[in-house]
């Protein structure tokens, strides 16, 4: 008789694949731009690159430090009227894409929560949960949490509002905090919470350390849903050099969680190349004309367009990343197991009941290193077999598809491996 | 009308560093990239670097990385360039220049107009 | 780096003449998307900051006189004094704005 399939998890649709930050509408959409009509023409953009959620903002009148100028429920004229964006919501939808507002309020000022009136903020915050609801986002976003007093509180009073409105809305936290502890603590009173954090930021150095902050992580967490990101806001060069790109694309797309990303993340978007740009919020390279300030700057293969045309760019790998992220078992729900696999790696196994299986290899080090799978590490329900096919590689050529021995993987400097293998009784 | 106005000239030894001022007036200083340009003695005229004062991001010359830094005051309307590590060939007159016309904080077009009086700054032991 | 050349170093020439100094770029500094040139001249005199006469390659700069003029593209542009005058005598440097770092030529002085 033939096993009984384990029963599947609920899941939400921000279990089922990437969010995608856009913070700032006019740095997204290049300069002249930056509204909601504009931003509507770029969904299909956002479709290709199969995320589930559009984060945005904030986009709220805002004067600078100034809480009685501040309007939660009024769209910055800049960006657009409520008008536009009931239209840019209806879009959205229509190609599956959820839309979450970010209402950190003084979002142009020095404190994002203001220094003063904490309980007139709240208040805002509150009123403006309930007007956007009704208005049809499916989520909300509050960055900068640490400066907000009794941050845990106020948290656990919106998630009610937003799950009491439909168990289908999110809310999410952004902080600037890397201390587990504090994450913890925030974490603690609300259950359903989406938190970013810089947790991982300075997981840069080493497969060991990586493997020992994400393990850590998800002891700490225990059943909770994850989600995973560098930072609450900024790109991921802020914190990688180029070569490791690819290598945390892998990682954040095959980790248990929801991987979020900022927009530019895909196409390994860097400030420091762009003289001037701010480095939280730098034009968005759609072509070559995207920066015609210093236009040698600028060269096809940091563009979206020139990336699109080369199968072997990051934008490939990030597009084929979110697209097996969101219909795989094992990525979707899968239990995860991390083993030991050398010095300089990080190894992972992701797995669902019956359903195809994933093994991923991550060299950390700026040296090739023979792997050595440490499968004893494993418990029986997730045994490695002799040989796994590739999947993909982080580097150009090798040959896809092909079966690899486990025992002799060797793995080029930088480079991440995800590999796939059937269920065995 | 638009003004620079430079710190006065200085006097250091090798190894020390200077750190000169450019006080802005008559536009919207966060609007405009600053620029520095310097010019030994007899010679052409070398670009080191700028800021975008409206977030403080810098770009440095190659020549220039890891011994300058510039920084910027939005509440007194100055920045600053700041070389450290100063040897003898780094006699010259240093200029702060804006940028020639901007779109936006973030979007600037770089010739160079107006240009500060210039501080000479002289190295010698 | 895009290096910038001047010609010729220096120029004598007599009041109320025509005079041309040419300006070269290791690569091309037009830019295909709006069709302009990343070029800028300058004037300095001794003692003085440079003052911008020229920008976009022929663009005159507001209160510059329009006996000065620019032209050119691609690699190759011309500052043109179409009648030198007494104050005119200064050194001229044109300057690429396309990539970083930016970079001037040398230089070019003209004398009466």
């Known amino acids: 008789r033939a096993p009984r399939c384990r029963e599947l998890p609920a899941q939400k649709w921000w279990h089922t694949g990437a969010l995608y930050r856009i913070g700032d509408l006019q740095a997204f959409q290049g300069h002249g731009a930056g509204n909601l009509a504009g931003l509507k023409g770029r969904l299909d953009y956002l479709s290709s690159l199969k995320v589930k959620g559009l984060v945005l903002g904030p986009i709220h009148k805002n004067q600078k430090d100034d809480v009685a100028q501040t309007d939660l429920l009024q769209i910055d004229p800049n960006f657009g009227s409520k008008e536009d964006f009931d239209s840019l919501l209806q879009s959205a939808k229509k190609k599956s894409i959820r839309v979450i507002l970010d209402l950190t309020p003084n979002y142009r000022g020095e404190n994002s929560w203001f220094s003063t009136q904490v309980d007139t903020v709240a208040t805002k915050v509150k009123d403006a949960l309930e007007f956007w609801l009704q208005a049809g986002v499916d989520g909300f976003q509050v960055r900068d949490i640490e400066n907000l007093k009794d941050a845990s509180s106020f948290l656990a009073e919106w998630q009610n509002i937003t799950k009491g409105f439909s168990e289908d809305r999110l809310l999410i936290a952004g902080t600037n905090s890397s201390d587990l502890q504090q994450i913890l603590s925030l974490l603690e009173s609300n259950k359903d919470l989406l938190l970013t954090s810089s947790y991982l930021s300075d997981s840069g150095s080493t497969g060991e350390h990586t493997k020992s902050l994400v393990t850590q992580y998800l002891n700490a967490t225990g059943n909770r849903w994850c989600s995973w990101s560098l930072s609450q806001a900024r790109l991921l060069t802020s914190f990688l050099p180029a070569q490791l790109l690819r290598l945390y694309q892998l990682m954040l797309f095959t980790l248990p969680g929801t991987p979020v990303f900022s927009y530019g993340d895909e196409i390994g978007l860097d400030a420091a190349a762009l003289p001037g740009q701010p480095m939280e919020a730098p034009v968005m390279l759609w072509d070559e004309s995207s920066f015609p300030d210093i236009p040698g700057a600028v060269s096809a293969n940091m563009t979206v367009k020139g990336q699109s045309e080369d199968p072997g760019s990051l934008l490939s790998l990030f597009r084929r990343l979110s697209d097996q992220r969101s219909k795989e078992r094992s990525l979707l729900h899968g239990d995860f197991h991390a083993f030991s696999a050398g010095p300089g790696l990080f190894s992972y196994i992701r797995h669902w009941d019956q359903n195809e299986r994933f093994l991923v290899v991550l060299n950390f080090g700026d040296v090739g290193l023979s792997a050595g799978l440490q499968a004893s590490d494993l418990p029986a329900s997730a045994s490695l077999p002799a040989k796994a096919d590739l999947l993909l590689s982080t580097q150009p050529g090798r040959e896809e598809g092909s079966p690899l021995e486990l025992e002799r993987l060797k793995l080029e400097p930088h480079e991440g491996l995800l590999l796939r293998f059937p269920y065995a009784a | 009308q638009v003004q620079l106005v430079q710190s006065g000239a200085e006097v250091k030894k090798p190894g020390a560093s200077v750190k000169v001022s450019c006080k802005a007036s008559?536009?919207?200083?966060?609007?405009?990239?600053m620029h520095w340009v310097r010019q030994a003695p007899g010679q052409g005229l070398e670009w080191m670097g700028l800021?975008?004062?409206?977030?403080?991001?810098?770009s440095y010359a190659q020549k220039f990385q890891g011994r300058v830094t510039m920084t910027r005051d939005t509440s007194t309307s100055t920045v600053y360039m700041e070389l450290s590590s100063l040897r003898s060939e780094d006699t010259a007159v240093y200029y702060c220049?804006?940028?020639?016309?901007?779109?936006?904080?973030?979007?600037?077009?770089?010739?160079?107009?107006?240009w500060g009086q210039g501080t000479l700054v002289t190295v010698s032991s | 780096d895009i290096v910038m050349t001047q010609s010729p170093d220096s120029l004598a020439v007599s009041l109320g003449e025509r005079a041309t100094i040419n300006c070269k770029s290791s690569?091309?500094?037009?830019?295909?998307?709006?069709?302009?040139?990343?070029l800028a001249w300058y004037q300095q005199k001794p003692g003085q900051p440079p003052k911008l006469l020229i920008y976009?390659?022929?663009t005159r700069e507001s209160g510059v006189p329009d006996r000065f003029s620019g032209s050119g593209s691609g690699t190759d542009f011309t500052l043109t004094f179409s009648s030198l005058q007494a104050e005119d005598v200064a050194v001229y440097y044109c300057?690429?704005?396309?990539?970083?770092?930016?970079?001037f030529g040398p230089g070019t002085k003209v004398d009466i």
């Open positions: 220049a804006r940028a020639g016309y901007c779109r936006s904080t973030t979007s600037c077009f770089n010739w160079f107009d107006p």
């Open positions: 008559g536009y919207t200083f966060t609007s405009y990239y």
């Open positions: 800021i975008n004062p409206s977030g403080g991001s810098t």
């Open positions: 690569q091309s500094v037009l830019y295909n998307s709006n069709n302009k040139n990343y």
């Open positions: 976009w390659a022929s």
């Open positions: 300057q690429q704005y396309y990539s970083t770092p930016f970079t």
